[in-house]
Interface confidence: low
Amino acid sequence: TTPEPCELDDEDFRCVCNFSEPQPDWSEAFQCVSAVEVEIHAGGLNLEPFLKRVDADADPRQYADTVKALRVRRLTVGAAQVPAQLLVGALRVLAYSRLKELTLEDLKITGTMPPLPLEATGLALSSLRLRNVSWATGRSWLAELQQWLKPGLKVLSIAQAHSPAFSCEQVRAFPALTSLDLSDNPGLGERGLMAALCPHKFPAIQNLALRNTGMETPTGVCAALAAAGVQPHSLDLSHNSLRATVNPSAPRCMWSSALNSLNLSFAGLEQVPKGLPAKLRVLDLSCNRLNRAPQPDELPEVDNLTLDGNPFLVPGTALPHEGSMNSGVVPAC
């Protein structure tokens, strides 16, 4: 017997569907109507045939009352080839729901997204996470998707993007966006970052994550942020292979005074990089290759400095973080 594709937990909180059959019974997903957190994985299926069975242009207001009754707040859709028209139809219906967080992963979006009809209402998401999503429309995908969202988006995460640079002239500002995560785009690089950080389109960013994005120096990142007018409070540059030295011909970059937390862990650093902000609340240099204790004049003024897992403290050992239990367990670097 084949296992049930959908499983709802005992608290009716989380429902996970794995549709791996060539002709899945999509009606099985109805058991998820009572769940707050829903995950639907489509096993790599092409959802093109769906367009024949649904009227993507139908007025979604006819479903408004039903959709409003759904408890779903977090929805993950993964592993499918989705026509843009179908995605738009789903977004139009979900606009009447109480959905707050949407994650799309391992999707191939085919075709172009039509513009938002005048009478249509956007989806009031607080968080949108995309991982390994490809769009037929290339660089204009964010602008096309953005018009289907209300302007209150607070968290945007884009990982393994096929086109992490955006068509900036088409993108509208994200006035409420406080967290932007472009991590796990190893081909991005500092020039790509400049292209992705559309100037003045991210005025409210407080947290910027750039883990594993091909960044080379903190100074190069500083220049990209300055060019875009982005002034994060917290910047994560961990898991990049960073150079400690600055190109002498490169102009000095003044970090924004708003920046108070900088993560440079797992960056392969053999010394504290030059060109750091003069003052920080938090600096994480853990799991690097520092062979000696940094001298005070090499460091910014910092209230909380983490140096766990560097060779000068002894190879392979680490120290507890502030607030962590000193259990003797060594975090692996």
Epitope: K279, R292, A293, P294, Q295, P296, L299, E301, V302, D303, N304, L305, T306, L307, F312, L313, L319, P320, H321, E322, N326
Partner: nanobody
């Protein structure tokens, strides 16, 4: 939050030895110095010995050649090996962590009594 806990104090005859230990919990910063101070009743605390994260040591003139400060590799524990103890070494010994970051901060243990008498 940093916490320091001393152990190893006690009574010993002149010429004897004691080993004090100070266990630290909380983070270690590159600019930290850990040390031992002592204070007799009514006196100011005076530095006995200190050690930095990088391993640099400092001693009071009165204990040079008799006392040795050391640490484990993670600086979770700092030791003070006291040899050839003298009656004038009798004091309460306090573990100290000095952190020079944006501002200089001192953290103290509660102290351990060392008594040298014949």
């Amino acid at each position: 939050q940093v916490q320091l806990q001393e152990s190893g104090g006690g009574s010993v005859q002149p010429g004897g030895s004691l080993r004090l230990s100070c266990s630290r919990s909380g983070p270690i910063y590159s600019v930290d110095t850990m040390g031992w101070y002592r204070r007799a009743p009514g006196e100011q605390r005076e530095l006995v010995a200190s050690i930095t994260v990088g391993g640099t040591t400092t001693y009071a003139d009165s204990v040079k050649g008799r006392f040795t400060i050391s640490r484990d590799n993670t600086m979770n524990t700092v030791y003070l090996q006291m040899n050839n103890l003298k009656i004038e070494d009798t004091d309460v010994y306090y573990c100290n962590l000095n952190r020079r970051l944006a501002k200089s901060e001192d953290y103290w243990g509660r102290g351990t009594q060392v008594t040298v008498s014949s």
